[in-house]
């Protein structure tokens, strides 16, 4: 089939001691091959400091996956979710303040 760019969605969930878990979800993309990783100040985190989801079919002939890491509250600006898919790339910031969801569709 033809290339379908991912919808990328970054969310935050509060955890204890001033730390938050940030999760980056990519969905509705084709083909299956994708790079999705957290960057701190533009540099990828080590693999062992991120949690990864499998790339799974989402039922529409496309795929979905996710990656998460833990950061200090107040340092959201330093972190971006980096996505590369079928020759396209993008960086997606962590929502700061009251906004806890950020969606972006790649074209």
């Amino acid at each position: 089939g033809s290339t379908v760019p991912p919808m990328v969605n970054v969310t935050c969930s509060e955890v204890s001691e001033g730390n938050i878990t940030v999760t980056c979800r990519a969905s509705s993309f084709y083909p299956r091959n994708i790079t999705l990783t957290w960057r701190q100040d533009g540099v990828s985190l080590s693999h062992n400091t991120q949690q990864w989801g499998d790339v799974l079919p989402d039922g529409n002939g496309t795929y979905q996956t996710w990656v998460a890491t833990r950061i200090r509250q107040g340092e959201e600006q330093r972190f971006t979710c980096y996505m590369e898919h079928s020759g396209n790339h993008g960086t997606h910031p962590v929502p700061s303040g009251n906004s806890h969801h950020h969606h972006h569709h790649h074209h």
């Epitope: 730390n19 701190q40 100040d41 533009g42 540099v43 990828s44 985190l45 080590s46 062992n48 400091t49 991120q50 890491t69 833990r70 950061i71 200090r72 340092e75 600006q77 330093r78 971006t80 790339h89 993008g90 960086t91 910031p93």
Partner: antibody
Framework: EIQLQQSGPELVKPGASVKVSCTAS????????IYWVKQSHGKSLEWIGY????????ISNQKFTGRATLTVDKSSSTAYLHLNSLTSEDSAVYYC???????????WGAGTTVTVSS | DILMTQTPLSLPVSLGDQASISCRSS???????????LEWYLQKPGQSPKLLIY???NRFSGVPDRFSGSGSGTDFTLKISRVEAEDLGVYYC?????????FGSGTKVEIK
């Protein structure tokens, strides 16, 4: 080959401003941040800040807040460091640098010497 | 700001010697998620710095295996197993776990 080409030396008067450029080649400019580092003569290195060329987002060392402005021109794959209200303390070599997958300053420009003198 | 203290400031060596440089941070530079962004750079006179080691112990592409990095928390070490003439210059440690990023004051490795 990945390269960062910096603008030439600058001699400026106290109180004036200067704009240093850093033109990237050999890679997709919006894939990687551009960092700026200061080195005063015979001294250590000082991180100024960085810019994400994809989003335009910046993070800076508070020491330089209000005096250093980081911008990019995506069409020419060029990053700029704009320094204002210059004093003799700003006389230094200014480097731009680019990270890699897991490291910060993997590629450096050759540096731009800024001399502040009346 | 996190202060990066390097010792010694000057390290006179004979070619073929082992050299060891210490870098101590004023607080732990292990980030919340376990990431430790500690790097080592070498700057030769009139040149831009060059990356040697990233994330404490990983050698950058093209860096000879006589260079090794180790440490954790607040204490880090760069070792050169057999110093060669091309290794002379100023070595800097650098932390990017916390903003502002900070460099050590430098260690000059020179011939005895």
């Amino acid at each position: 080959e990945i390269q960062l080409q910096q603008s030439g030396p600058e001699l400026v008067k106290p109180g004036a401003s200067v704009k240093v450029s850093c033109t990237a080649s050999g890679y997709a400019f919006t894939k990687y941040n551009i960092y700026w580092v200061k080195q005063s003569h015979g001294k250590s290195l000082e991180w100024i800040g960085y810019i994400d060329p994809y989003t335009g987002g910046t993070i800076s060392n508070q020491k330089f807040t209000g005096r250093a402005t980081l911008t990019v021109d995506k069409s020419s794959s060029t990053a700029y460091l704009h320094l204002n209200s210059l004093t003799s303390e700003d006389s230094a070599v200014y480097y731009c640098a680019r990270p890699g997958s897991y490291w910060y300053f993997g590629v450096w420009g050759a540096g731009t010497t800024v001399t502040v003198s009346s | 700001d996190i202060l990066m203290t390097q010792t010694p400031l000057s390290l006179p060596v004979s070619l073929g010697d082992q050299a060891s440089i210490s870098c101590r941070s004023s607080q732990s530079i292990v980030y919340t998620n376990g990431n430790t962004n500690l790097e080592w750079y070498l700057q030769k006179p009139g040149q831009s710095p060059k990356l040697l080691i990233y994330k404490v112990s990983n050698r950058f592409s093209g860096v000879p295996d006589r260079f090794s990095g180790s440490g954790s928390g607040t204490d880090f070490t760069l070792k050169i197993s057999r110093v060669e003439a091309e290794d002379l210059g100023v070595y800097y440690c650098f932390q990017a776990s916390y903003v502002p990023f900070t460099f050590g004051s430098g260690t000059k490795v020179e011939i005895k």
